[in-house]
């Protein structure tokens, strides 16, 4: 069944103060988690694209924390940037519950598909409370599979993801160890429509400068118009905000020559909040590459760098998941897929005839490595974060 199905619609949040929803309390933590994880990935390699969903990963592990105890439990929440002396755990889970409800609204124009699957070894007796909370708070499910038959187990997991993404993500899990007893898969797929689309016929192949010596050809979208764009001295970067239909905003950061690392180090939640509050528009000639970007991460190694190690080790306390036997998380995979192209609503181009000032507008070309964030506007939460080093990288 659809993990974002009925459960997502039945959540009652009427008892909350709607002016200050609980998700507001977790948003800064999610943002700082995003930057921590980004910096960790950037530190590992400066020549590869980075792309992940902070919201999606944090949701998966906050959900997992429901079944953990002691150090295993604290490590996860601290690794996700939560300080339990400042925010009660119940509020963390309520925050995620509301966040998911907002992201999965059926009438949303946001073309976002996200899900978590927990796969446990057949024969394990699962704790009812855990299963209930996973469904109620996180709109997710736990399944039992026969990990003894690794091919069949792999097929079941991949079929679940393929079905959940309407075929957009296939073969997520490439291999499973025979001793796997507990696997977590987490996926998110997004292909939005711009509020103000680009003209497809203006897209032309141009050079993208991967580094001083490497240049690749990319289809470059172009538009002369009014943009929420500014040059930020503090970040030594051009900062462009572009709205999607359905309450999402993309923020693109184009660093000045040699300032990529400076930008990566300076990004904070407060800075992002300021950009989101600024609605000023100015004329610019924008060149932005079309992108099909995918990030696939083994979360065991990635989150290990952020201090989340115990849940993957033999000393894990997952007694909230099953009391039967010692259990550890054997595999955790995250896959994020994003397409950035010219499209908006059908015939939207005609609706946005803009008066361009006569002064010569700056030409801002995203034709070298840049960083981007995608923010869900209602919750101000970071749906995606990434770095494009080479748009042609598979």
């Amino acid at each position: 069944e659809d993990p974002q199905g009925d459960a997502a619609q039945k959540t009652d949040t009427s008892h909350h103060d709607q002016d200050h929803p609980t998700f507001n309390k977790i948003t800064p933590n999610l943002a700082e988690f995003a930057f921590s994880l980004y910096r960790q990935l950037a530190h590992q390699s400066n020549s590869t694209n980075i792309f992940f969903s902070p919201v999606s990963i944090a949701t998966a592990f906050a959900m997992l924390s429901l079944g953990t105890k002691a150090d295993t439990h604290d490590e996860i929440l601290e690794g996700l940037n939560f300080n339990l002396t400042e925010i009660p755990e119940a509020q963390i889970h309520e925050g995620f519950q509301e966040l998911l409800r907002t992201l999965n609204q059926p009438d949303s124009q946001l073309q976002l598909t996200t899900g978590n699957g927990l796969f446990l070894s057949e024969g394990l007796k699962l704790v009812d409370k855990f299963l209930e909370d996973v469904k109620k708070l996180y709109h997710s499910e736990a399944f039992t599979v026969n990990f003894g038959d690794t091919e069949e187990a792999k097929k079941q997991i991949n079929d679940y993801v393929e079905k959940g993404t309407q075929g957009k993500i296939v073969d997520l899990v490439k291999e499973l160890d025979r001793d796997t007893v507990f696997a977590l898969v987490n996926y998110i797929f997004f292909k939005g429509k711009w509020e103000r689309p680009f003209e497809v016929k203006d897209t032309e192949e141009e050079d993208f400068h991967v580094d001083q010596v490497t240049t690749v050809k990319v289809p470059m979208m172009k538009r002369l118009g009014m943009f929420n764009i500014q040059h930020c001295k503090k970040l030594s970067s051009w900062v462009l905000l572009m709205k999607y239909l359905g309450n999402a905003t993309a923020i693109f950061f184009l660093p000045d020559e040699g300032k990529l690392q400076h930008l990566e180090n300076e990004l904070t939640h407060d800075i992002i909040t300021k950009f989101l509050e600024n609605e000023d528009r100015r004329s610019a000639s924008l060149h932005l590459p079309k992108l099909s970007i995918t990030g696939t991460y083994d979360l065991k190694s990635v989150l290990g760098q952020l201090g989340i190690t115990k849940v993957f080790s033999n000393g894990a306390d997952l007694s909230g998941v099953t009391e039967e036997a010692p259990l550890k998380l054997s595999k955790a995979v995250h896959k994020a897929v994003l397409t950035i192209d010219e499209k908006g609503t059908e015939a939207a181009g005609a609706m946005f005839l803009e008066a361009i000032p006569m002064s010569i507008p700056p030409e801002v070309k995203f034709n070298k490595p840049f960083v981007f964030l995608m923010i869900e506007q209602n919750t101000k939460s970071p749906l995606f974060m990434g770095k494009v080093v080479n748009p042609t990288q598979k």
Epitope: K191, E205, S292, D341
Partner: antibody, heavy 117, light 107 residues
Amino acid sequence: QVQLQQPGAELVKPGAPVKLSCKASGYIFTSYWMNWVKQRPGRGLEWIGKIDPSDSETHYNQKFKDKATLTVDKSSSTAFIQLSSLTSEDSAVYYCVRSPGGYPDWWGQGTTLTVSS
Amino acid sequence: DITMTQSPSSIYASLGKRVTITCKASQDINSYLSWFQQKPGKSPKTLIYRANRLVDGVPSRFSGSGSGQDYSLTISSLEYEDMGIYYCLQYDEFPYTFGGGTKLEIK
């Protein structure tokens, strides 16, 4: 290096359908549109339509709307054109042509389709 | 549909000469025009897009110009390998439409 590989020739009986393929390599398949162009001997070039492999959005020349169907298989980076109810008028060379946006920039070698009993 | 009228339908020209081919659209196509070269038995090759932008690797003796409804392709100094058929294409509106072609032969 960009490559668009098309079979050299196809021989099909009148009334039957045919599905021509175009296997793309050397670039990100989902970032470029794929056009199909028909060329009959001494008759110039005709644009049939184009498809966006990322989401299968299509635009057709109305003249070919009932004749041609464009599809893609993202997993194999292959574009297809299905031609129905073939007649001798459909005998031609069919090119697949990549396009970053509007203008076609990279042409396949073409498939010569012969409709004959 | 937009009609693209190409002229002349054929040209005989000497090596080293300047050659110009024109294309007239039945309405303003906003410079969304490409030029192609096709040699016998081969697939077409894109030379120019957006009326005047040269595709990478195409010799600089080829140039495009024009706006509105009227466009031209110029070869500044004809070389032997330039023989073939030249086509224009408008991609301003669906359906895209090609000109009828200009056959260029060497005298």
